[in-house]
Every structure is written in structure tokens, then in C-alpha cells.
Interface confidence: medium
């Protein structure tokens, strides 16, 4: 499907609004430190150029690739060397190496200030004064903080952001209307970013075979009535979409995502009975809805898997003829029968089945050798089932904050070399699995919990890759994508770790503690908890609980005092001394 001008093709396909939004997202994800105005200027220049190509596809430079056009534009930024250091060296390279270079310099943890939410009236005024700029600013601020955010989905978030302001800035109580909507968008946005980051890590670190296996399992669960070839078609198309977005090809990605939504809606009968209400929606909503659609009902008459994959004498013949197809069909058949399993478990089962066939099809009596293969799955299935059961019991017993603290202690003991902010962020998010998944019925708990944990642990892997400090983390992150969670679960107290020297400054607090939000207070306390464990990795739960209870009492007391700062100055050293004694 060749076009004389790629930029004209995409401009016509996407329309001006989406084209400009996607180019802004692309530039903001590459040059994360550039000021907003600089990006808007670059986007306007690219858009004007695209329009000239639409008018005449033979015009000068219109035949250049999008990477060439966008890369040339990014390389015109005057302060590239001062702001980005060695990233400026990318501009000396030719395509495709230049784009690869830009991709490698994306920063998952950019040194950007947290977004502060202004007063509602201030936001509504800004929205009414210049709606277009207000929404561009949203795209820019999210994209630069989340350089792998799924771009077409970010356009959907921006549309919801716009709708929230359009509705709530007219409301009698603007804040009551707007703030819950913004909170929901923020939380959903963070979750969406983390999920997409795992998809990109899967493609970039483990290859498209790993991503395709994940997609076969997930789509087979969602669309159990679809036949294997149909699921495979969707997987092929979905892989192309995510490969493009993860590679920075955001215009192609958005265009292909729209094509995939169109295909699914035109072929609902052979895919799923659940697509109908998605397909009545406008494009951005439709694509989002299709991605989140609930699992269709399983066909009633599915035969036993054992007949084709264990009892048949042709198993090794079928495997030998086309290994990937046979394993793909096994994964499809297993997944469509098990919406109650996590995708990662299904992939482990497929791996175990493959390993058994590799061994048994070379044996003297293959059938005898693989006859018990399904029995070997039992421990693989029970491990995540037990993990979910135990952790949900703990969550119900402790509540979210204390459950997070239990995980903080657990993970700090496993990998104490990891930075405190990373341990706090990751453990807090691991702890959110309780509220998200434990309330669900039994059949939905494991897929919810384990697949969510995979997303959170990927964040740990991504942050750790930037600043590697622990061989154990590197090993769990790089050896096997599907076994990451079991690998982390299996880690014990790091006996080789030399405890961190006690630093009183780490445990010195001030009156500003009292004005923090509840979440910020929790983060402060949890930061102290991690530091305590790093100082005394062998401290018991009881000892740590005692210290944390004293800490909470000390903060509460000083925040009630008339002279708060004096109280912190006097009581702080007492708390530190008492804590050291308690942990001695």
C-alpha cells in the first residue's frame, strides 16, 4: 500500500485534529524536557508542511519518510546539546539509526516536577480562554511524563478531559463535578501508561513472538467463540499496531488501530457477541471500548483438550509439521477454556507443554512420555492460586495501607539495594492489587491479580534497568517475561546485603509534615519504613510495627501541638533514640 507522500497519506487518513495531537505526543515523548511553546511551534511547522503535501504530493521533501521528517524537525531544536547531552549525538546519525537512538534515550523517570492541580476556577478560566491550548498542554504534560503512553488512547483521554471541563465548568458546584472526574482520569491514565509500558517491554526486550503469545492467550479468553485463524488475524494486526506505537510511529499506529476497530466491527459475527455496543460509538471511544470489552461466553460444546493434545497418536507429527502453529493452537484452545487463569499462567502452561514435547517427541515411546503432561500443570496452576488466596486474606485482615507496608517490608528484604523511592512506588502499587482484585469473584481474581502484578513489576524492571543495582532484580527481569512474578515471589532475604548505616537525617521530620495530604503522609511514613528495613533487614514484624506505631503517635502529637516545629525538634531525637533501641 505505497503512497507518494507518507505524510500526506496520514494527514488525510487521520484528519488535522488527530494528526496534530499525535505529532505533539510523538515530539513530547522524544524531547521530554522541551518547553510546551517549542513543541507547539514544531507541530505547527510539521502540520503546515503536511498540508502542502496534501495539496501536491510531488512537492519538495513530501516523499521523505515520517522518521526523516520528524527527526529533521527535532534536530532543529537549538538547545538540544545543553538540555539533553549525548542525545544530541543522535542527530549525527542517518535513519533508521537516528530514530533508534531517540528511542533509546526515552526516559521512564524524567526529572520533571509533579503536576500540581490549580484551583478549579483557574482551570475553568484557562479552559474557556483557550480550549485548544489547554488541551494541547494536557497532551504535552502527560506524554513527556509517560514516554510510552499509547498515543491513540491518549487522544481518547484528552477527549474525556475536554468533556469533563465542558460539563463541569458550567455546573453550580464546579469542584464537586470536576475533581472526581480528574481523579478518575489520573488513576486510569497511570494504569493505562503502565499497561502499555509492559507491552512495549515485551516487544522490545523479548521480541514479537513473546507479544504474539500474550495476545493469543488474552484474545482467546476474550473471544472464545472465534476460531483460531480469526484470533490469529487479530493478533497479527494488534502486534503491528503496538510495534508501531512502541517504536514511535504514532501516526501509522493510530491509523492501523482505526483499521483494526473497523475490521472487528465489520466481522463481529466471527469474533464476539460483545462488540455491538462498542461498534456504535465514535472512533476513539470505539477503539477503547473494544480493547476493554468483557470476555464473551464460552461455547457450550467445547471438547476435552486431552483428545488432540495428549491422547492423539499424532501429537508429535502435528508438532513437527509446524511447531509454532501447533503451540499457538494449544494456547488458543487452553485460553478460551480458562478465562479464570491469568495470561501469564497460560503462557507458563504453553511453555511447559512445549518443553514436554521437545523432550518426549525424541523419546523411544513419545506417547507414554507425554501421557501425563496435564498432571504436570497442576503445581503451575496451584502456585498463583495459593498466592492470590494468601495475599487477599492478608489484605482483608490489614486494609490497604498496612498491606502496602507488609509488601514494603517484604520487597525491601528481597532487594534492599533498590532505591527507596522506587521501593515505595512499586510496593504501594503492588498493594493496590488488594482493592482492585480481592473483591472480585473467585473466577476473576487470578487473572486480575497476576496480570496486574506483571504490569507493576515491569515498572520495577524498567526503573532498575536505568540504574542497575541488584543482580537479583536483573535476573528476574531479564530471564523470562512469563516467570518474572514467580521469580520475585521466590526471592528471600538478601543475606549478602550489608545493612545501611543509620542516618539520623533520614528520620528527621518537620512541621510541614502536618500540612501534607493523607497520601503524602503515607509516603513519608513508608519511606521511613523502607529506610528502617535497609538499616535493620532482620528486624521482626513486631519490632517494625512498634517503631511505626510510635512514629504515627509522634507525628500525631506534634501536629496537634501549638508550636509544631518545636515539638518536632524536641520529640524527633527521642523517637530516633527509642527506635534504635527497639531495633538493637
Amino acid at each position: 500500500d505505497t503512497h507518494k507522500s507518507e505524510v500526506a497519506h496520514r494527514f488525510k487518513d487521520l484528519g488535522e485534529e488527530h494528526f496534530k495531537g499525535l505529532v505533539l505526543v510523538a515530539f513530547s515523548q522524544y524531547l521530554q524536557q522541551c518547553p510546551f511553546e517549542e513543541h507547539v511551534k514544531l507541530v505547527n511547522e510539521v502540520t503546515e508542511f503536511a498540508k502542502t503535501c496534501v495539496a501536491d504530493e510531488s512537492a519538495e521533501n513530501c516523499d521523505k519518510s515520517l522518521h526523516t521528517l520528524f527527526g529533521d524537525k527535532l534536530c532543529t531544536v537549538a538547545t538540544l546539546r545543553e538540555t539533553y547531552g549525548e542525545m544530541a549525538d543522535c542527530c549525527a546519525k542517518q535513519e533508521p539509526e537516528r530514530n533508534e537512538c531517540f528511542l533509546q534515550h526515552k526516559d521512564d523517570n524524567p526529572n520533571l516536577p509533579p503536576l500540581v492541580r490549580p484551583e478549579v476556577d483557574v482551570m475553568c478560566t484557562a479552559f474557556h480562554d483557550n480550549e485548544a491550548t489547554f488541551l494541547k498542554k494536557y497532551l504535552y504534560e502527560v506524554a513527556r511524563r509517560h514516554p510510552y503512553f499509547y498515543a491513540p488512547e491518549l487522544l481518547f483521554f484528552a477527549a474525556r478531559y475536554k468533556a469533563a471541563f465542558a460539563e463541569c465548568c458550567q455546573a453550580a458546584d464546579k469542584a464537586a463535578c470536576l475533581l472526581p472526574k480528574l481523579d478518575e482520569l489520573r488513576d486510569e491514565g497511570k494504569a493505562s501508561s503502565a499497561k502499555q509500558r509492559l507491552k512495549c517491554a515485551s516487544l522490545q526486550k523479548f521480541g514479537d513472538r513473546a507479544f504474539k503469545a500474550w495476545a493469543v492467550a488474552r484474545l482467546s479468553q476474550k473471544f472464545p467463540k472465534a476460531e483460531f485463524a480469526e484470533v490469529s488475524k487479530l493478533v497479527t494486526d494488534l502486534t503491528k499496531v503496538h510495534t508501531e506505537c512502541c517504536h514511535g510511529d504514532l501516526l501509522e499506529c493510530a491509523d492501523d488501530r482505526a483499521d483494526l476497530a473497523k475490521y472487528m466491527c465489520e466481522n463481529q459475527d466471527s469474533i464476539s457477541s460483545k462488540l455491538k455496543e462498542c461498534c456504535d460509538k465514535p472512533l476513539l471511544e470505539k477503539s477503547h471500548c473494544l480493547a476493554e470489552v468483557e470476555n464473551d461466553e464460552m461455547p457450550a460444546d467445547l471438547p476435552s483438550l486431552a483428545a488432540d493434545y495428549v491422547e492423539s497418536k499424532d501429537v508429535c507429527k502435528n508438532y513437527a509439521e509446524a511447531k509454532d502453529v501447533f503451540l499457538g493452537m494449544f494456547l488458543y484452545e487452553y485460553a478460551r477454556r480458562h478465562p479464570d487463569y491469568s495470561v501469564m499462567l497460560l503462557l507458563r502452561l504453553a511453555k511447559a507443554y512445549e518443553a514436554t514435547l521437545e523432550k518426549c517427541c525424541a523419546a523411544a515411546d513419545p506417547h507414554e512420555c507425554y501421557a501425563k503432561v496435564f498432571d504436570e500443570f497442576q503445581p503451575l496452576v496451584e502456585e498463583p492460586q495459593n498466592l492470590v488466596k494468601q495475599n487477599c486474606e492478608l489484605f482483608e485482615q490489614l486494609g490497604e495501607y498496612k498491606f502496602q507496608n507488609a509488601l514494603l517490608v517484604r520487597y525491601t528484604k528481597k532487594v534492599p539495594q533498590v532505591s527507596t523511592p522506587t521501593l515505595v512506588e512499586v510496593s504501594r502499587n503492588l498493594g493496590k492489587v488488594g482493592a482492585k482484585c480481592c473483591k472480585l469473584p473467585e473466577a476473576k481474581r487470578m487473572p486480575c491479580a497476576e496480570d496486574y502484578l506483571s504490569v507493576v513489576l515491569n515498572r520495577l524492571c524498567v526503573l532498575h534497568e536505568k540504574t542497575p543495582v541488584s543482580e537479583k532484580v536483573t535476573k528476574c527481569c531479564t530471564e523470562s517475561l512469563v516467570n518474572r512474578r514467580p521469580c520475585f515471589s521466590a526471592l528471600e532475604l538478601d543475606e549478602a546485603y550489608v545493612p545501611k548505616a543509620f542516618n539520623a537525617e533520614t528520620f528527621t521530620f518537620h512541621a510541614d509534615m502536618c500540612t501534607l495530604s493523607e497520601k503524602e503522609k503515607q509516603v513519608k511514613k513508608q519511606t521511613a519504613l523502607v529506610e528502617l528495613v535497609k538499616h535493620k533487614p532482620k528486624a521482626t514484624k513486631e519490632q517494625l510495627k512498634g517503631v511505626m506505631d510510635n512514629f504515627a503517635a509522634f507525628v500525631e502529637k506534634c501536629c496537634k501541638a501549638d508550636d509544631k516545629e518545636a515539638c518536632f525538634a524536641e520529640e524527633g531525637p527521642k523517637f530516633v533514640a527509642a527506635s534504635q533501641a527497639a531495633l538493637a
Epitope: F228, A229, E230, K233, D237, D308
Partner: nanobody, 117 residues
Framework: EVQLLESGGGLVQPGGSLRLSCAAS????????MGWVRQAPGKGLEWVSL????????YYADSVKGRFTISRDNSKNTLYLQMNSLRAEDTAVYYC??????????WGQGTLVTVSS
């Protein structure tokens, strides 16, 4: 009634090429995954290739990957198999077949391909 009619078989030298065609009728061709299956003399059936209705998802047996190309023309209700770099072990009766859910449900009569010098 479903009908599948293969053509294009014949005698060819090793390293040569052939193109098989399969004319389909009696069903909505563009709704079905289609495939080719072969049976060598004295051997069991071996599936060769499958193609999704859209033409975009294609599978090949490992033994033919890189040499055979399956394609379809939905406007003509026709399935094709382009066979290049043919070997003696490709000698077989080639059947065009319709795929339904978990297996092939309708087959043609077959066309014989002989690879010999």
C-alpha cells in the same frame, strides 16, 4: 452444495515451479479460512498451508516455509498455491480444503503433483 475443484498439478523437475488453483462454489468463500493438504504416496495426510479470509494471516508447515506461497482472490472465489524450488519429497496429491473451527470439513478431489527428473 459445497464444491472445491483443484487444477494445475502435473510433472515438474526438481527446482521447478507450479501454481495450483482451487475454484470454490456453494458457500460464501470470503467467510472461510481455506487451506491446502497433501498426501504423499503411501503416507498420511500432511497439512501444507492455511489462509484467513482477509488474506493477511497465513500459516505454512515448516517443510514448505519459504518455498510455497498461499493466496486467494475472494472476488473470483479462488484459492492458489504457488510452489517454487520443488523437491522430490513434495510429490503428492494436493487437496484444497475448507477450514471450519477446528478441522477441515470439505475437500476437493485432489490434483497430483509429481517432482521427478
Amino acid at each position: 452444495e459445497v464444491q472445491l475443484l483443484e487444477s494445475g498439478g502435473g510433472l515438474v523437475q526438481p527446482g521447478g515451479s507450479l501454481r495450483l488453483s482451487c475454484a470454490a462454489s456453494g458457500f460464501t468463500f470470503n467467510h472461510y479460512t481455506m487451506g491446502w493438504v497433501r498426501q504423499a504416496p503411501g503416507k498420511g495426510l500432511e497439512w501444507v498451508s492455511l489462509i484467513h479470509p482477509s488474506g493477511t494471516v497465513i500459516y505454512y508447515a515448516d517443510s514448505v516455509k519459504g518455498r510455497f506461497t498461499i493466496s486467494r482472490d475472494n472476488s473470483k472465489n479462488t484459492l492458489y498455491l504457488q510452489m517454487n524450488s520443488l523437491r522430490a519429497e513434495d510429490t503428492a496429491v494436493y487437496y484444497c480444503a475448507r477450514w471450519s473451527s477446528r478441522a477441515f470439513d470439505y475437500w476437493g478431489q485432489g490434483t497430483l503433483v509429481t517432482v521427478s527428473s
